[in-house]
């Protein structure tokens, strides 16, 4: 199957990379992490037809037993392929720290 | 947050193992399979609500964005968290050939 | 464009007290924390420690915690790094830098500081 | 001495490709990333690789990172006279957070 990149429902309708302003509020960190206020997180949206950005065999499977049996097998999904890494200034008992995070934000997508 | 596996949904009804059965023409590969006829596809169906199975930070961060925007941002969505190998008996040019697969069996799954 | 304006070089005597500036220009500062970075004469990069300007949250390498002091007036835009009691080995060039958004790398670097510390 | 290991130096001759290994463990690179930097004589450092394999814009593509496991490198391509500089690699650390390699000078041949 070909691993297609061009949606074929529009620009922009197909499983692609968005960013989502959000507040620490927003995200439910408030009452634990301290910086940054704000974050501009980037998420897999999208919808994701036949051969477009299947990660693997499993996808294409997938996808044909959807399109056989729609009620039962869900269309494959948008989901990050890999993430940026990301440090945040936290609370602590004694203070604050730095933390890494390796799975926070999406960094590419494909459909699985 | 909890990484949940009660589903407060109802039994059964969230993001889980299924097994589907299907033939090799269901699958789109009547043309170039040989063995087996037929395979038992395990794969990853279910709803994701809050908390349940989350794979990592993103998709606690997707889950509170969809809570806060349910038009924009999609809810977690039911994948597989690894795989179980699975050979084929394959057509080839010459004959016959054995391939191994790794991604074509959902083992375990996850909301992402 | 982004840019960090650090003072000018330093010479001090043993014991004497210091403060170096980074000024920031071309972003909106409070939204980017600045890390200062040491250099002795000859040797790598070390890193000092951190400051989110928005809430002056400070966090310092355990190497450096105690011996230097971090801070920040977001009203100037401007970082600092400063000494209450110099001493010899602190003689080192002292960059200020920007961190990327995510806050795992380092994105603008600031020209330096060469603080020399002699008696 | 540094968390992360580099070479002290490497060379190599105009038009050539060299590598810069940068060696951690499973606290750092294994289970993070790595950025790299460069430092012209007399200047401060420059962002050339962010989050293992990311060139900011401006670098030219001569320059690109990889990973693997719990060692990084960086590959410079069409090797020019005005590569010559200090290269550090740096990561995360748990224990001292922000983590630099003891910096690898390139000198180009000739």
């Known amino acids: 199957a070909r691993n297609g990149d061009r949606c074929p429902l529009g620009p922009g309708r197909c499983c692609r990379l968005h960013t989502v302003h959000a507040s620490l509020e927003d995200l439910g960190w408030a009452d634990w992490v301290l910086s940054p206020r704000e974050v501009q997180v980037t998420m897999c949206i999208g919808a994701c037809p036949s051969q477009f950005r299947e990660a693997n065999m499993h996808a294409q499977i997938k996808m044909n037993l959807h399109r056989l049996k729609p009620d039962t097998v869900p269309a494959p999904c948008c989901v990050p392929a890999s993430y940026n890494p990301m440090v945040l200034i936290q609370k602590t008992d004694t203070g604050v720290s730095l933390q890494t995070y390796d799975d926070l934000l999406a960094k590419d997508c494909h459909c699985v | 947050a909890r990484n949940g596996d009660r589903c407060p949904l109802g039994p059964g009804r969230c993001c889980r193992l299924h097994t589907v059965h299907a033939s090799l023409e269901d699958l789109g590969w009547a043309d170039w399979v040989l063995s087996p006829r037929e395979v038992q596809v395990t794969m990853c169906i279910g709803a994701c609500p809050s908390q349940f199975r989350e794979a990592n930070m993103h998709a606690q961060i997707k889950m509170n964005l969809h809570r806060l925007k349910p038009d924009t941002v999609p809810a977690p969505c039911c994948v597989p968290a690894s795989y179980n190998p699975m050979v084929l008996i394959q057509k080839t040019d010459t004959g016959v050939s054995l391939q191994t697969y790794d991604d074509l069996l959902a083992k375990d799954c996850h909301c992402v | 464009e982004v840019q960090l304006v650090q003072s000018g070089a330093e010479v001090k005597k043993p014991g004497e007290s210091l403060k170096i500036s980074c000024k920031g220009s071309g972003y909106s500062f409070t939204s980017y924390w600045i890390g200062w970075v040491r250099q002795m004469p000859g040797k790598g990069l070390e890193w000092m420690g951190v400051i989110d300007p928005d809430g002056s949250y400070t966090i310092y390498s355990p190497s450096f915690q105690g011996q230097v002091t971090i801070s920040a007036d977001k009203s100037i835009s401007t970082a600092y790094l400063q000494w209450s009691s110099l001493k010899a080995s602190d003689t080192a060039m002292y960059y200020c830098?920007?961190?990327?958004?995510?806050?795992?790398?380092?994105?603008?670097w600031g020209q330096g500081t060469l603080v020399t510390v002699s008696s | 001495q540094s968390v992360l290991t580099q070479p002290p130096s490497v060379s190599g001759a105009p038009g050539q490709r060299v590598t810069i290994s940068c060696s951690g463990s499973?606290?750092?690179?294994?289970?993070?990333?790595v950025n790299w930097y460069q430092q012209l004589p007399g200047t401060a450092p420059k962002l050339l690789i962010y989050?293992?394999?990311n060139r900011p814009s401006g670098v030219p593509d001569r320059f690109s990172g990889s990973k693997s496991g719990t060692s990084a490198s960086l590959a410079i391509t069409g090797l020019q006279a005005e590569d010559e500089a200090d290269y550090y690699c740096?990561?995360?650390?748990?224990?001292?957070?922000?983590?630099f390699g003891g910096g690898t000078k390139l000198t180009v041949l000739g």
């Open positions: 989050s293992n394999d």
């Open positions: 740096q990561s995360w650390d748990s224990s001292s957070n922000y983590v």
């Open positions: 830098a920007r961190y990327g958004r995510y806050g795992t790398y380092f994105d603008y």
């Open positions: 499973s606290s750092n690179i294994g289970v993070l990333y």
